[in-house]
């Protein structure tokens, strides 16, 4: 396993609809044709997998149908969007990139993006 640099923004604020987007960029050390991207969430010293996708260079990034993540790839950067977020989902979201093929295998883990999610205030009852 060889190490690889990964960069991502330090902080992102989710929209009022619970959607957060950020870029994950990696320093590809060679001609990788198969790349796996995983988003991990770290909160209270626990790390859980949020979503993952494997893609072939030049093809679309495909997450599972029930995934809360969507994304697009362009060269050695991936644009990730996480949907359905609520205040309790606030945490550090870490981008993990693996160059699966051809060998050698490379692994890169970003420093994480702190995503803040604020639940919208319910609208007050109106007389109208």
């Amino acid at each position: 396993c060889k190490a690889m640099h990964v960069a991502q923004p330090a902080v992102v604020l989710a929209s009022s609809r619970g959607i957060a987007s950020f870029v994950c960029e990696y320093a590809s050390p060679g001609k990788a044709t198969e790349v796996r991207v995983t988003v991990l969430r770290q909160a209270d010293s626990q790390v859980t997998e949020v979503c993952a996708a494997t893609y072939m260079m030049g093809n679309e990034l495909t997450f599972l149908d029930d995934s809360i993540c969507t994304g697009t790839s362009s060269g050695n950067q991936v644009n990730l969007t996480i949907q359905g977020l609520r205040a309790m989902d606030t945490g550090l979201y870490i981008c993990k990139v693996e160059l699966m093929y051809p060998p050698p295998y490379y692994l890169g883990i970003g420093n994480g993006t702190q995503i803040y999610v604020i639940d919208p205030e319910p609208c007050p009852d109106s007389d109208f």
Partner: nanobody, 126 residues
Framework: EVQLVESGGGLVQPGGSLRLSCAAS????????VGWFRQAPGKEREELAC????????DYPGSVKGRFTITRDNAKNTVYLQMNSLRAEDTAVYYC???????????????????WGQGTQVTVSS
Amino acid sequence: EVQLVESGGGLVQPGGSLRLSCAASGDTLESFAVGWFRQAPGKEREELACIGRTGEFTDYPGSVKGRFTITRDNAKNTVYLQMNSLRAEDTAVYYCAAERLVFHLCSLSEYDYDTWGQGTQVTVSS
């Protein structure tokens, strides 16, 4: 859209040095990571070096590490490749390529670059 033009190639004796330039027009190069590649007749394109947008991140394959150095001058919209201790096997057409990125990293994979120069010939011979 950014356009790239390489220069600085030519004939050099074994053991000599050359500095190649990659000049950009049509856009500011500071928005782009830049890579240098080469292709010899009948061979695959080979990665040589890359540099991130700010110049703080560079990467080289083992084959040229220590002999080749990549630098950039964003004020001049130019990236340079300094090549020392040249050998006959360094004879090839040298290309620079650019990729618009958000952060400071760069890639050594030709697959990641979408804008290429037309190349400059380097011949190492006595």
